[in-house]
């Protein structure tokens, strides 16, 4: 006997095939022998079964011999044997209808649990394999669960589900709710203007919730909260900000900060925090604000760096077009008698310069 | 709820082969059967032909020498081909779904065929 | 091939008018009969299948019946919305075929 899997909610064809390739009697049946349709003349009549009014023939493959049956909006009870009676011989038609659904909501939070469930026919014993978007593959019988959600598992999910050497594919889209970054660092000269950009790293119709920046100068011994604000339907408003600091916020996404200005005693890490409506948890982002500064003071010239720096970072005083250079591994490096000319401040990663400032020497006579 | 969207060129030249793509998103791929169908301007409907998921085709004879329907499944996607056009080809193309009747139907695409 | 012959090829009418659209069929196709509405540059609506069952959505002013060859489309009381092309098909063999169509205009 045929083996057809389906899908819940989804449509199957059943095939029956006559060898005469002309239109013919036949009808379809169910195990419990009730007729689900068949033709009178060149009519499709249905009988009483519950699947009547969800059942279909093509009329036009008729002529070809071909009496398929089709079951729209397919239910999980659907399953069952089915009988195609014509020329006088039986075809039978095993179906097999699986569901696999989510358990919760498919838009989770970072370090959320995604479980997804399988629906199957009584006596069957199908197995499903599931791969993320990131190539992922988690096995499992009549669950699956992922503990983690991580951002890149956000995307379709393809599960595929065995049953008798045959199988059916589900795509799920799971949005993980995450910004775009776990972690950010602005390196700015002092007095500069400094932009944060939290960009979220997905898309909703309606984004309603609230937020708070709370945050760590690194000459504190607290943190404080620099502004709160909340978001209705991709709209933000502040409701509270500090006096020092006084931050400003952009009013659409992506959420945007502007410092006025880059001072030692704002650097520091800052933590973003996001509660979004309907959801429990909340969405973080992590931000670092690095300032340099550099200065001549007599006979003395300086330059140094405030806020969370990595030990591998390199800090150099260097003399523009000169050999003359002193570099550190250290948050401050200087210069005494500094010879006369443009002086460059530079905090490097490997080579890579992070922030310069310049300074200019000018002779003492 | 089950969307048609279709899209190719929309100017040939004699001779020339035109070439339509229609995506299904929503609704089942699998059960159904999907349909070209094509209007003249200011005249009426031509059926073209028609495609399953595992690629089995039926054909209106009057084009049958110069059409190929495909089907992509992974993509839920299938095509119309139709060689050596002419004048009389200038239509707008629909793709629907069919099991005995058309619908819902993609949103239609201007061809013209011009030299 | 069925060829499928409508009638009238145009028709003039007033809101809340009663207008019937025929269809013929060139052989028998029982029910196998569908009602189509398209409005300019738009594609095609099915309105009625099995020459009498209702798509979901569709008015009850409009109605179907027939089998065999002679099948009727009636709108009951016609409303702005409705002054539009209206199409028969027939899904009885390939291949489908298709009436040249009645348009439906404002008098």
């Known amino acids: 006997k045929k083996v057809v899997l389906g899908k819940k909610g989804d449509t199957v064809e059943l095939t029956c095939n006559a060898s005469q390739k002309k239109n013919t009697q036949f009808h379809w049946k169910n195990s419990n022998q009730i007729k689900i349709l068949g033709i009178q003349g060149l009519f499709l009549t249905k009988g009483p079964s519950k699947l009547s009014d969800r059942a279909d023939s093509r009329k036009s493959l008729w002529d070809q011999g071909c009496f398929s049956m089709i079951i729209k909006n397919l239910k999980i009870e659907d399953s069952d044997t089915y009988i195609c009676e014509v020329e006088n011989k039986k075809e039978e038609v095993e179906l097999l209808v699986f569901g696999l659904t989510a358990n919760s909501d498919t838009h989770l939070l970072e370090g959320q649990s995604l479980t997804l469930t399988l629906e199957s026919p009584p006596g069957s014993s199908p197995s499903v394999k599931c791969r993320s978007p990131g190539g992922k593959n988690i096995q499992g019988g009549r669950t699956i669960s992922v503990p983690q959600l991580e951002r890149q598992d956000s995307g379709t999910w393809t599960c595929t589900v065995s049953q008798d050497q045959k199988t059916v594919e589900f795509k799920i889209d799971i949005v993980v709710l995450a910004f775009q970054k776990a972690s950010s660092t602005v390196y700015k000269k002092e007095g500069e203007q400094v932009e944060f950009s939290f960009p979220l790293a997905f898309t909703l119709e309606k984004l309603t919730g609230s937020g708070e920046l709370w945050w760590q100068a690194e000459r504190a011994s607290s943190s404080k909260s620099w502004i709160t604000f909340d978001l209705k339907n991709k709209e933000v408003s502040v409701k509270r900000v500090t006096q020092d600091p006084k931050l400003q916020m952009g009013k659409k996404l992506p959420l945007h900060l502007t410092l006025p200005q880059a001072l030692p005693q704002y650097a520091g890490s800052g933590n973003l925090t996001l509660a979004l409506e309907a959801k429990t948890g909340k969405l973080h982002q992590e931000v670092n604000l690095v300032v340099m500064r550099a200065t001549q003071f007599q006979e003395n010239l300086t330059c140094e760096v405030w806020g969370p720096t990595s030990p591998k970072l390199t800090l150099s005083l260097k003399l523009e077009n000169k050999g003359a250079t002193v570099s550190k591994q250290a948050k401050a490096v200087w210069v005494l008698n500094p010879e006369a000319g443009m002086w460059q401040c530079l905090l490097s990663d490997s080579g890579q310069v992070l922030l310069e400032s310049n300074i200019k020497v000018v002779p003492t006579w | 709820q089950v969307q048609l969207q279709q899209w190719g060129a929309g100017l040939l030249k004699p001779s020339e082969t035109l070439s339509l793509t229609c995506a299904v998103y929503?609704?089942?791929?699998?059960?159904?059967?999907w349909s070209w169908i094509r209007q003249p301007p200011g005249k009426g409907l031509e059926w073209i032909g028609e495609?399953?998921?595992?690629?089995?085709?039926n054909y209106n004879p009057s084009l049958k020498s110069r059409v190929t329907i495909s089907v992509v499944t992974s993509k839920n996607q299938f095509s119309l081909k139709l060689s050596s056009v002419t004048a009389a080809d200038t239509a707008v193309y629909y793709c629907?779904?069919?099991?005995?009747?058309?619908?819902?139907w993609g949103q239609g695409t201007l061809v013209t065929v011009s030299s | 091939d069925i060829q499928m012959t409508q009638s009238p090829s145009s028709v003039s009418a007033s809101v809340g008018d009663r207008v019937t659209i025929t269809c013929r069929a060139s052989?028998?196709?029982?029910?196998?009969l569908a009602w189509y509405q398209q409005k300019p540059g738009k594609a095609p609506k099915l309105l009625i299948y099995?020459?009498?069952s209702f798509q979901s959505g569709v008015p009850s002013r409009f109605s179907g019946s027939g089998s065999g060859t002679d099948f009727t489309l009636t709108i009951s009381s016609l409303q702005p919305e409705d002054f539009a092309t209206y199409f028969c098909?027939?899904?009885?063999?390939?291949?489908?075929?298709f009436g040249q169509g009645t348009k439906l205009e404002i008098k």
């Open positions: 629907a779904r069919v099991l005995n009747w058309f619908d819902p």
């Open positions: 929503g609704g089942s791929f699998s059960g159904y059967y």
């Open positions: 495609i399953n998921h595992s690629g089995s085709t």
């Open positions: 052989q028998d196709i029982a029910d196998w």
């Open positions: 099995a020459a009498s």
């Open positions: 098909q027939q899904a009885n063999s390939f291949p489908y075929t």
